[in-house]
């Protein structure tokens, strides 16, 4: 079944969902509760939570994997990832967006066989929505001391976005406040008529400028943020590209 609420339901009806292993009764996977799987097409409003279930049994206890549109479904394939609750044979996606639309297949396998079941998810867009940031931006960058660098944050928002560029900083020699959250400094922010707020330009950089830069975008509905790292190299070293890392801003200075 699929739910579309903001809270993950506790599965209290799972008496048949998890079948204990018995060596003398080996068998291929089988569905234990087909009623929960009858509804294949799910149209869910954006921002809601979706749960797909494939309650199964077998001996030995089968493993479960999920495919999206016939391909392995990885955590990095969606913002916020997803949860798999193996004991409840469920896939949970919170705050669904249009890009989550598609076919979701549970693949249940053990050494004696394999079964699968496919759900189709349609996300009904409720506009306006919180900002969406283009994947991969801002991109990690490196430059030599004295060089210039530009970070770009591409924003899609159908309500007026407020853009902030934020950097982790130290205060009294500490990177973290008394509450354990990092100190953050707003380097640039947009006003209603601000132009080019999507670009943060740094000139004549020093080693002090190295670190994580966060593009944080808010509209009246919600927020989104992505980050990139700046590596500052000694003048004799050539720039290198680094793998992107994301983080969430917590503590504004």
């Amino acid at each position: 079944d699929a739910i579309s609420s903001g809270d993950d339901e506790d599965d209290t009806d799972s008496s048949e969902d998890f079948v204990s292993e018995n060596r003398s009764n080996q068998r291929a996977p089988y569905w234990t509760n087909t009623e929960k799987m009858e509804k294949r097409l799910h149209a869910v409003p954006a921002a809601n939570t979706v749960k797909f279930r494939c309650p199964a049994g077998g001996n030995p206890t089968p493993t479960m994997r999920w495919l999206k549109n016939g391909k392995e479904f990885k955590q990095e394939h969606r913002i916020g990832g997803y949860k798999v609750r193996n004991q409840h044979w469920s896939l949970i996606m919170e705050s669904v967006v249009p890009s989550d639309k598609g076919n979701y297949t549970c693949l249940v396998e053990n050494e004696y066989g394999s079964i699968n079941h496919t759900y189709h998810l349609d996300v009904v867009e409720r506009s306006p929505h919180r900002p969406i940031l283009q994947a991969g931006l801002p991109a990690n960058a490196s430059t030599v001391v004295g060089g210039d660098v530009e970070f770009v944050c591409k924003v899609y928002s159908d309500a007026q976005p407020h853009i902030q560029w934020i950097k982790h900083v130290e205060k009294n020699g500490s990177k973290y406040g008394p509450d354990g959250l990092p100190y953050l400094k707003v380097l640039k922010h947009s006003g209603i008529n601000s132009s080019n707020a999507e670009v943060l330009a740094l000139f004549n950089v020093t080693e002090m400028d190295a670190g994580e830069y966060i593009c944080k975008v808010s509209n009246y509905i919600g927020q989104a943020n992505q980050s990139a790292w700046l590596t500052v190299l000694p003048k004799q070293q050539a720039p290198v590209r680094e793998k992107e890392i994301t983080a969430s801003p917590d503590y504004l200075e």
């Epitope: 609420s5 903001g6 921002a47 809601n48 306006p128 919180r130 309500a159 209603i192 808010s218 919600g222």
Partner: antibody
Framework: EVQLHQSGTVLARPGASVKMSCKTS????????MHWIKQRPGQGLEWIGA????????NYNQKFKGKAKLTAVTSASTAYMDLSSLTNEDSAVYYC??????WGQGTTLTVSS | QIVLTQSPAIMSASPGEKVTMTCSAS?????MSWYQQKPGSSPRLLIY???NLASGVPVRFSGSGSGTSYSLTISRMEAEDAATYYC?????????FGGGTKLEIK
């Protein structure tokens, strides 16, 4: 179904403080700003401020800084507003709203000695 | 802050009549929202992003405008449309509402 359920009518003395709640269900509470709106009897609507439950970010209308304090408990999907140093001017209906299209039923506050 | 001025403050219309009310902003805006409120009820979103109809709102309601001038139109007035209508801007802090237009049925 999305629901925002606000706490009931409050009667308070001048100078006192009150706390009202807005319990939500049916959507991902942490992902959306929760706005608070004031409406005095027979008057228009005023934006007090908003809280983003995911990280605790808060924006206040300058007019209500020091008067209103916004908080949220994500585990309970509930937003709160404290109003302090109450005067007759604070007598109003207070609404919580998320996304602009989801509204609570309002909490009526009457300040009277 | 951006001041929104609605006009007229009060108006009346007969069933079937076309109704237009306006909202003027003290500074240019990207978008405008419109709400309907009936006595004893919470505001109800009618129009977002200037011209988009909110879920469940009858198609007789429409919104238009840009910059500093916006309007809400009801193509054919119905008795249930008697209410107070507010414009609101979500573009600039502090977010602000207009003073409202009270629409009565003749």
């Amino acid at each position: 179904e999305v629901q925002l359920h606000q706490s009931g009518t409050v009667l308070a003395r001048p100078g006192a403080s009150v706390k009202m709640s807005c319990k939500t269900s049916g959507y991902t509470f942490t992902n959306y700003w929760m706005h608070w709106i004031k409406q005095r009897p027979g008057q228009g609507l005023e934006w007090i401020g908003a809280i983003y439950p995911e990280n605790g970010d808060i924006n206040y209308n300058q007019k209500f800084k020091g008067k209103a304090k916004l908080t949220a408990v994500t585990s309970a999907s509930t937003a709160y507003m404290d109003l302090s140093s109450l005067t007759n001017e604070d007598s109003a209906v207070y609404y919580c709203t998320s996304r602009g299209d989801y509204w609570g039923q309002g909490t009526t506050l009457t300040v009277s000695s | 802050q951006i001041v929104l001025t609605q006009s007229p403050a009060i108006m009346s219309a007969s069933p079937g009549e076309k109704v237009t009310m306006t909202c003027s902003a003290s500074s240019g805006l990207s978008y405008m929202s419109w709400y309907q409120q009936k006595p004893g009820s919470s505001p109800r979103l009618l129009i977002y992003d200037t011209s988009n109809l909110a879920s469940g709102v009858p198609v007789r309601f429409s919104g238009s405008g840009s910059g500093t001038s916006y309007s809400l139109t009801i193509s054919r007035m119905e008795a249930e449309d008697a209410a107070t209508y507010y414009c609101q801007q979500w573009s600039s802090y502090p977010y602000t509402f207009g003073g409202g237009t009270k629409l009565e049925i003749k």
